[in-house]
């Protein structure tokens, strides 16, 4: 959804924390790719 | 079992404290978002505020600071601290975990519920 | 400040009927709403989430549509069980808001 009213600090929170994990589990994988293909 | 216990109800004279506590199993309460919601005898839900994994927190614009939540992550335990207390302030008192945040959804939504502990206010 | 408006506030229908319910959001909530059960003397239990998503364990007679500030659930055929309050919630934001939640829709019995 568009950002419009996810503007409060709550949402702004909830936001960063789901790019967080979201950049965690998608660098967890790449890190677990390099390992496997050494 | 995932479960969240809440205990501390009871009956309160006006203008007095209460100290209410939402016990976590079965899951680790400092991974989540959670939060106090109460529902006055007959009447609807009403939500109260919520804390943060970072312990920052949220109120209901009704509340004006006479309500504090808090948690001990050691303990695995929420707690609401209730001050100033008032007859209008007699309720079921319910804590309830929030769901996770996606990249695509990160509203907020209440996915696990206590059994709720009743506050009565009365002299 | 987001306000959530339930109607009807209580609904009479037979077991077999199709039950809808709306929630009106004072400002575009896009599809951040939820919708609860509650029973008497229990505690509420989440039904649907991000409009229209159902959440584990839920039957399929229950669904949810909408978008923006208008949102319905229905009930496709009211079981016996059925029978309880349903409330709507927006999951947009916190920040000086005063209370969430709708006010409820009692389903009883006609």
């Known amino acids: 959804h568009s950002d419009g009213i996810f503007t409060d600090s709550y949402s702004r929170y909830r936001k960063q924390m789901a790019v967080k994990k979201y950049l965690a589990a998608v660098l967890g994988k790449r890190y677990k790719q390099r390992v496997k293909n050494k | 079992e995932v479960q969240l216990v809440e205990s501390g109800g009871g009956l309160v004279q006006p203008g007095g404290s209460l100290r209410l506590s939402c016990a976590a199993s079965g899951f680790s309460l400092s991974s989540y978002d959670m939060s106090w919601v109460r529902q006055a005898p007959g009447k609807g839900l009403e939500w109260i505020g919520i804390?943060?994994?970072?312990?920052?927190?949220w109120y209901a614009s009704w509340v004006k600071g006479r309500f504090t939540i808090s948690r001990d992550n050691s303990k695995n335990t929420l707690y609401l601290q209730m001050n100033s207390l008032r007859a209008e302030d007699t309720a079921v008192y319910y804590c309830?975990?929030?769901?996770?945040?996606?990249?695509?959804?990160?509203?907020?939504?209440?996915?696990?519920w206590g059994q709720g502990t009743l506050v009565t206010v009365s002299s | 400040d987001i306000q959530m408006t339930q109607s009807p506030s209580t609904l009479s229908a037979s077991v077999g009927d199709r039950v809808t319910i709306t929630c009106l959001a004072s400002q575009n909530i896009y599809n951040s709403l939820a919708w609860y059960q509650q029973k008497p003397g229990k505690a509420p239990k989440l039904l649907i989430y991000r409009a229209s998503t159902l959440a584990s364990g839920v039957p399929s007679r229950f669904s949810g549509s909408g978008s923006g500030t208008e949102f319905t659930l229905t009930i496709s055929s009211l079981q016996p069980d059925d029978f309880a309050t349903y409330y709507c919630?927006?999951?947009?934001?916190?920040?000086?808001?005063?209370?969430?939640f709708g006010g409820g829709t009692k389903v009883e019995i006609k």
């Open positions: 309830a975990r929030i769901s996770d945040a996606y990249v695509f959804d990160y509203a907020y939504y209440f996915t696990l």
């Open positions: 919630q927006q999951g947009a934001g916190a920040d000086n808001i005063g209370n969430p």
């Open positions: 804390i943060n994994t970072n312990d920052d927190t």
